[in-house]
């Protein structure tokens, strides 16, 4: 299989994943579809880290479009070698993939911290607090304690679901970018395509 085709496939996948990350992160700002919690600053502090919007979203679009552009046959040779431009492009995609790894890594770390800490909610005492912060993530295994959060309604389910989605999406993005690092190195060193006989018209 052509290294370029592989990169293009990864690129398209990353665009979809990035958009899903942005949507998941935006939903975190509106528990139960309400805007008041964001305006009153009653949202988990990790929501404000924009991990899905920036890390797993916008930052992921840069490598995604770089990867998609790799299969286009508009890259001419360098140093008198027609294949050299393609090889340079594949190697430069490694840099883009590293940016993707950083973005997805940030998304994964923030989502994991958000899950571990739990949501900011109105606790059983009637105060806005991180009710589960001291449980070190154990609240995730004991759903009976989730009723300790009384407002926003179902905030624990909301936070757990969306941060888990961000964690999973960020993880997949991380793996895809890692694959592209390997793909880009192989494509750059071994040649743009597995078939060394393949010629490109400039």
């Amino acid at each position: 299989m052509c290294y370029g085709k592989c990169a293009r496939c990864i690129g398209h996948s990353l665009v979809g994943l990035a958009l899903l990350c942005i949507i998941a992160n935006i939903l975190l700002y509106f528990p139960n579809g309400e805007t008041k919690y964001a305006s009153e600053n009653h949202l988990s502090r990790f929501v404000w880290f924009f991990s899905g919007i920036v890390g797993g979203g916008l930052l992921m679009l840069l490598p995604a479009f770089v990867f998609i552009g790799l299969e286009q046959d508009d890259c001419c040779g360098c140093c008198g070698h027609e294949n050299c431009g393609k090889r340079c492009a594949m190697l430069s995609s490694v840099l883009a993939a590293l940016i993707g790894i950083a973005g997805s890594g940030y998304c994964v770390i923030v989502a994991a911290l958000g899950l571990a800490e739990g949501p900011l909610c109105l606790d059983s005492f009637g105060q806005w607090n991180y009710t589960f912060a001291s449980t070190e993530g154990q609240y995730l295994l004991d759903t009976s304690t989730w009723s300790q959060c009384t407002e926003p309604k179902h905030i624990v389910e909301w936070n757990v679901s969306l941060f888990s989605i961000l964690l999973a999406l960020g993880g997949i993005e991380f793996i895809l970018c890692l694959i592209q690092v390997i793909n880009g190195v192989l494509g750059g060193i071994c040649g743009f395509c597995c078939s060394r006989q393949q010629q490109y018209d400039c």
């Epitope: 059983s124 005492f125 105060q127 991180y130 009384t150």
Partner: antibody, heavy 118, light 113 residues
């Protein structure tokens, strides 16, 4: 206007039980947690516990008052109750119900004076 | 339990003066996650229920005159009344709601000089 109307003064004998009520009005009852505080004559304030009417009712108690106080609610009348049992002269005090907002008790009942005497 | 210590227990002042009272807690009341101090100040006049003046250590409750100011963080807090009025001469309590059981200070009584 937020109002917390408490039941009248009580004079009871040692060992008896009493039920103090706190009827709320002027706000959405389920939006706030109700707390109970007591003040012995000429002394400071003591937190007894809280009752959150959501999720089937969530109660928190000061360990000192566990077994002494029980908090209940009647949602239909937006009223919170506090049962006090095995009363002694030490329990003679003014008992307040109060609503929490942010981290402060922003509305208070007028207080219920409990006198335990033989 | 968190112990709240208020000082002085009583204070003699004249109308128009600026007065400062202290409240110290046995452990920090600052929540590092919410970045708020879980401390409130109350005023209680004889025969009346307490009245909320300050919450989150420094946020003035609506309707409370701006001569009342709360400050401090962690374990040391202060309530300042600038230009004391005759109606301010009463008892003031601080309260922590950082950890249950919530506890009140012993109070500071403002008296006429």
């Amino acid at each position: 206007e937020v109002q917390l109307q408490q039941s009248g003064p009580e004079l009871v004998k040692p060992g008896a039980s009493v039920k103090i009520s706190c009827k709320t009005s002027g706000y959405t009852f389920t939006d706030y947690t109700m707390h109970w505080v007591r003040q012995s004559h000429g002394k400071s304030l003591e937190w007894i516990g809280s009752f959150n009417p959501n999720n089937g009712g969530l109660t928190n108690y000061n360990q000192k008052f566990k077994g002494k106080a029980t908090l209940t609610v009647d949602k239909s009348s937006s009223t919170v109750y506090m049962d006090l049992r095995s009363l002694t002269s030490e329990d003679s005090a003014v008992y307040y119900c109060t609503r929490i907002r942010a981290t402060g008790f922003d509305s208070w009942g007028q207080g219920t004076t409990l006198t335990v005497s033989s | 339990d968190i112990v709240m210590s208020q000082s002085p227990s009583s204070l003699a002042v004249s109308a128009g003066e600026k007065v400062t009272m202290s409240c110290k807690s046995s452990q920090s009341l600052l929540n590092s996650r919410t970045r708020k101090n879980y401390l409130a100040w109350y005023q209680q006049k004889p025969g009346q229920s307490p009245k909320l003046l300050i919450y989150w250590a420094s946020t003035r409750e609506s309707g409370v005159p701006d001569r009342f100011t709360g400050s401090g963080s962690g374990t040391d807090f202060t309530l300042t009344i600038s230009n004391v009025q005759a109606e301010d001469l009463t008892v003031y309590y601080c309260k922590q709601s950082y950890n249950p059981p919530w506890t009140f200070g012993g109070g500071t009584k403002l008296e006429i000089k």
